[in-house]
């Protein structure tokens, strides 16, 4: 499993972009098979982020090789039955680290999309996907969580109580000869998510659930989230009927609880509080929050919503505030540009997250042999001769100000400058006029002063003038 430049796809380059160490992480998104592959539609089947990822260090000038990826699994839980056909979207994100990163700290490097057919319970499928100059090698599989079985995880099976036969009226679970298919009729009200039955009109609970209808969660430790401790025998109780009970979301929408209420994630073509509104063309205005609708001129063609920064979802209905994580240090402004986050730093700070204090000599060195001087809560660079600017990165021309008077020629020199004076003039800057009768120079100069020979002077110091 690796991510890197593909063969014959242009000049090899490192994901780290020659800007120091970086970290890659992956976002995996599952969409229904009918979903448009190239669009930013809702990950209706599920989505997940990779967790532990190693830091890659790239040195400028090195040829970029594919980066080995850790074997850590990315688990994407899916709701309901496994559809068999689906769209698999894998986004590769780069997080730039280190002090010379520059630019946005996070960038979407590559996005591969492919429509796939896969039965649950099968072996790992290997895949290679290319996009632009990048190539991603990965494997994937679908598996059911017990007690679900089958290619679609739609049947509930339990181990047989006896090796030879299933319970009354129950058939063997093909192709699982050691398991029995659960009956279709359980006790009325038995939780379809947390209960099952091996005989009609019973309600057996899956691990972690209890109660006559398997609606009460069991906990051996402290109660999680909004659950409250119940009687000792029942463990933890939900405060009451959940807002998602019975799934209020229509048209295939999936429900999630949000602070006592619910929120529907609607499939493409539906929106509204309960996904009850159908609007499959751009004329219906399906894109919210300033999203730009593209395509979908008629009901048979799909539309795509291009969402502004801070919004996502097939209809730009989901507010996401990536800046709420406060990635910018030292009071920098976080700007969500959609494709990336950027930190704009306050004066005196720099770096992709404004992590470097420029007023601190430890923060950044002065270039070209300059020395850093701190004082009064700020820092400045004392530059070597021939260099200037805030960080001594600008080449200074000592002759630019025409320092040699009376037509003298200026020569840049390692220790400053040298003036070659015109006949009749002398001095460091040719400021003295020499009297033709051999009298004192004007203005007066010390007796015995001779005009320097710049050629011999330069040669003596083993430096050639520029």
């Amino acid at each position: 499993h690796s991510f890197g430049p593909g063969p014959g796809l242009g000049t090899p380059r490192s994901p780290c972009n020659a800007r120091g160490p970086c970290r890659l992480f992956f976002r995996v998104c599952l969409k229904p098979g009918v979903s448009q592959e190239a669009t930013e539609s809702l990950c209706a089947l599920g989505a997940a982020l990779s967790t532990s990822v190693p830091v890659y260090t790239e040195h400028p000038g090195e040829s970029a090789a594919a980066l080995p990826l850790p074997d850590g699994l990315v688990r994407v839980p899916f709701r309901d039955a496994w559809p068999g056909t689906f769209s698999l979207v894998i986004e590769t994100w780069r997080e730039q680290l280190g002090e010379h990163a520059g630019g946005p700290a996070w960038n979407l490097l590559a996005r591969v999309v492919g429509r796939r057919r896969l039965a649950a319970g099968g072996p790992w499928a290997r895949d290679v996907q290319r996009t632009g100059t990048w190539e991603l090698h990965f494997s994937y599989r679908a598996r059911c969580e017990p007690p679900a079985v089958g290619a679609a995880c739609a049947r509930l099976c339990r181990s047989r109580s006896a090796p030879s036969r299933c319970g009354p009226g129950l058939r063997p679970c093909t192709p699982f000869p050691d398991e029995c298919e659960a009956p279709s009729v359980c006790r009325p009200g038995c939780s379809p998510e947390h209960g099952y039955c091996e005989e009609p009109d019973e309600c057996r609970c899956l691990e972690g659930w209890t109660g006559p209808l398997c609606t009460v969660p069991v906990s051996t430790s402290s109660c999680l989230n909004s659950r409250v401790p119940g009687p000792a025998s029942t463990g933890c109780l939900l405060p009451g009927p959940g807002p998602c009970d019975g799934n209020p979301c229509a048209n295939g929408g999936s429900c999630s609880e949000t602070s006592g209420s619910f929120e529907c994630a609607c499939p493409r073509g539906f929106y509204g509080l309960r996904c009850e509104v159908s609007g499959v063309t751009c004329a219906d205005g399906p894109c919210f929050n300033g999203g730009l609708c593209v395509g979908g001129e008629d009901p048979d063609s799909a539309y795509v919503c291009h969402c502004p920064p801070g919004f996502q979802g097939s209809n730009c209905e989901k507010r996401v505030d990536r800046c709420s994580l406060q990635p910018c240090q030292n009071g920098g402004l976080c700007l969500d540009l959609g494709h990336a986050l950027r930190c704009r730093c306050r004066a005196g700070f720099a770096g992709p997250r404004c992590e470097h204090d420029l007023d601190d000599c430890a923060g950044r060195a002065c270039a070209n042999g300059g020395t850093c001087v701190e004082g009064g809560g700020s820092r400045r660079c004392s530059c070597a001769l021939g260099f200037g600017g805030r960080d001594c990165r600008e080449r200074a021309d000592p002759c630019a100000s025409r320092p040699c008077a009376h037509g003298g020629r200026c020569y840049a020199h390692f220790s400053g400058l040298v003036c070659a004076c015109a006949p009749g003039y002398m001095g460091v800057r040719c400021e003295f006029a020499v009297r033709p009768d051999g009298a004192d120079a004007v203005p007066a100069a010390p007796r015995g002063l001779r005009q320097a020979d710049p050629q011999r002077f330069l040669h003596h110091h083993h430096h050639h003038h520029h």
């Epitope: 300033g290 502004p308 801070g310």
Partner: antibody
Framework: EVQLLESGGGLVQPGGSLRLSCAAS????????MNWVRQAPGKGLEWVST????????YYADSVKGRFTISRDNSKNTLYLQMNSLRAEDTAVFYC???????????????WGQGTLVTVSS | DIQMTQSPSAMSASVGDRVTITCRAS??????LAWFQQKPGKVPKRLIY???SLQSGVPSRFSGSGSGTEFTLTISSLQPEDFATYFC?????????FGGGTKVEIK
């Protein structure tokens, strides 16, 4: 289409106060950082202040720090600039503007308002 | 603070001329630079963003180049409606700073 409309300018005496407003429409106001920029008569442009989309982060030019306060009400799609201790040198046309960082994201309309004139004189 | 030095401050040119305006940043600003055009009594109009990207609706005779500290706005063939004042703006870091402006007048 993006539109920005400033109001609240006028004549005020030195030491006085004024509150400028900027009504925004045509884009998701709360997603974008906003700026105030001013231009003294016959002079160049000067950045005054910036506020983040959420309103949680604010930034000021040294010339107005401690006297001006930028704020926003995202429920009303409105940006504000409260100006106190006004001086003669604050006389200028004040523009509200969407932050230049978003110039490649938004299309159509004006990223700058038409401006409102603030005159500080006795 | 980053100083933006714009040159020339004023220039005379004729219709059809190629005009070049320069902005120099006192320290590197990557490509976080925008160019504006302003006519008397009007609002500044954005021409170029990200140093070299042409804003939609702006004629292709306008172009921007440069990165780091040296930036250039070029008008390939000056038109009558291009006589105006041009400003650069750096938005790499706070405080945001504008160039002093270049007034392009009719020769």
């Amino acid at each position: 289409e993006v539109q920005l409309l400033e109001s609240g300018g006028g004549l005020v005496q030195p030491g006085g106060s004024l509150r400028l407003s900027c009504a925004a429409s045509g884009f998701t106001f709360s997603s974008y950082a906003m700026n105030w920029v001013r231009q003294a008569p016959g002079k160049g442009l000067e950045w005054v202040s910036t506020i983040s989309g959420s309103g949680g982060s604010t930034y000021y030019a040294d010339s107005v720090k401690g006297r001006f306060t930028i704020s926003r009400d995202n429920s009303k799609n409105t940006l504000y600039l409260q100006m106190n201790s006004l001086r003669a040198e604050d006389t200028a046309v004040f523009y509200c503007a969407i932050d230049p960082e978003y110039y490649d994201i938004l299309t159509g309309g004006d990223y700058w308002g038409q401006g409102t004139l603030v005159t500080v004189s006795s | 603070d980053i100083q933006m030095t714009q040159s020339p401050s004023a220039m005379s040119a004729s219709v059809g001329d190629r005009v070049t305006i320069t902005c120099r940043a006192s320290q590197g600003i990557s490509n976080y630079l925008a160019w504006f055009q302003q006519k008397p009594g009007k609002v500044p109009k954005r021409l170029i963003y990200a140093a070299s990207s042409l804003q939609s609706g702006v004629p292709s005779r306008f172009s921007g180049s440069g990165s780091g500290t040296e930036f250039t706005l070029t008008i390939s063939s000056l038109q009558p409606e291009d006589f105006a004042t041009y400003f650069c703006l750096q938005h790499d870091s706070f405080p945001l700073t504008f160039g002093g402006g270049t007034k392009v007048e009719i020769k």
